[in-house]
């Protein structure tokens, strides 16, 4: 529950549409855990691609592309009875507006692929 | 490349630490694609847990927890020679500060689990 139960939630309609944001990030070191190699060891491996946009904060976002159409089995062969699919997440970024050197930003939603997982098809069909 | 090459990048040291942010979200409908059922169909299925915090924007974030230690095989049995692991991503959220009804927020990093994938162990050992 909120520390101030009377405060409007930032998602409420009556909440101010423009707020002040401090860019000194808290929890800056959440990424201190070693970089995972799951992208290589997964049965649905992926490559990471750098998406860079200087008008955005953060300016660099890494996105996943599935390497295979099917999934890698225990023998290292691709099984096309299964599908490698991207796991997507909606994230919030700050977009500089109105596109000149101001300190004004707007929240923007981005749908990013974070990694891949192996799923069973639900439709059986003959190729 | 930036539309204004002379503009400081928001990650530069000389960029103002406090900026104005418009909360009217652009690209609000990136999630218009149908909700995916991969969490159930994956060989490393997961459950989604609601993480709610009214002092944060967005106040609701869904987090994945892998259902199994191993991965589900073609027969629906759990294979413990493989591991279900969470795919994690660092996201930015806005944290209300200094924790009373102000329009001031601070960027905060959160490490969230978005889904699970099935990986091969790198250490083989006998139990």
């Amino acid at each position: 529950s909120p520390q101030n139960p009377g405060c409007p939630n930032a998602e409420d309609k009556n909440f101010p549409r423009t707020v002040m944001v401090n860019l000194n990030i808290r929890n800056r070191n959440t990424n201190s855990k070693r970089a995972s190699d799951y992208y290589n060891r997964s049965s649905s491996p992926w490559n990471l691609h750098r998406n860079e946009d200087p008008e955005r904060y953060p300016s660099v976002i890494w996105e996943a592309k599935c390497r295979h159409l099917g999934c890698v089995d225990a023998d290292g062969n691709v099984d096309y009875h299964m599908n490698s699919v991207p796991i997507q997440q909606e994230i919030l970024v700050l977009r500089r507006e109105p596109r000149h050197c101001t300190n004004s930003f707007r929240l923007e939603k981005m749908l990013v692929s974070v990694g891949c997982t192996c799923v069973t098809p639900i439709v059986r069909h003959v190729a | 490349s930036p539309q204004n090459p002379g503009c400081p990048n928001a990650e530069d040291k000389n960029f103002p630490r406090t900026v104005m942010v418009n909360l009217n979200i652009r690209n609000r409908n990136t999630n218009s694609k149908r909700a995916s059922d991969y969490y159930n169909r994956s060989s490393s299925p997961w459950n989604l847990h609601r993480n709610e915090d009214p002092e944060r924007y967005p106040s609701v974030i869904w987090e994945a927890k892998c259902r199994h230690l191993g991965c589900v095989d073609a027969d629906g049995n759990v294979d413990y020679h493989m591991n279900s692991v969470p795919i994690q991503q660092e996201i930015l959220v806005l944290r209300r500060e200094p924790r009373h009804c102000t329009n001031s927020f601070r960027l905060e990093k959160m490490l969230v689990s978005v889904g699970c994938t099935c990986v091969t162990p790198i250490v083989r050992h006998v139990a």
Epitope: R67, H68, S113, P121, I122, V123, H125, A127 | -
Partner: nanobody, 125 residues
């Protein structure tokens, strides 16, 4: 609505070659697997070949295996279908699609979308 644009079709003799292109001018599908399909008069659209988002993996219908090769150029946002040793039964309108769903296996036509107008391939002597 975003659409893919196919080109490169034409009339060719049996045993000849053609290279089809599928352009994604908006860069909308650089993270999607892509597929080529074909539709002959009076028949349903059928799967020909597919390629993964990274280009590392390809899959072919049995009828074209060893003769056709799918590839993608990420810099140009284009997917290609190199067709060799063409046969009269390859005559059809060829379409490319972006894989947007995963209800079926890789050759399931309904999992693909954003078709273009297609490009006609005619194999005839």
């Amino acid at each position: 609505e975003v659409q893919l644009v196919e080109s490169g079709g034409g009339v060719v003799q049996p045993g000849g070659s053609l290279r089809l292109s599928c352009a994604d001018s908006e860069r909308s599908f650089s993270f999607n697997a892509m597929g080529w399909f074909r539709q002959a008069p009076g028949k349903e659209r059928e799967f020909v070949a597919a390629i993964s988002a990274t280009g590392d993996d390809t899959y072919y219908a049995d009828s074209v295996k060893g003769r056709f090769a799918i590839s993608r150029d990420t810099a140009r946002n284009t997917v290609y279908l190199q067709m060799n040793s063409l046969k009269p039964e390859d005559t059809a309108v060829y379409y490319c699609g972006a894989r947007v769903n995963f209800d079926g296996t890789v050759s399931y036509t309904n999992d693909y979308a954003y078709w273009g107008q297609g490009t006609q391939v005619t194999v005839s002597s």
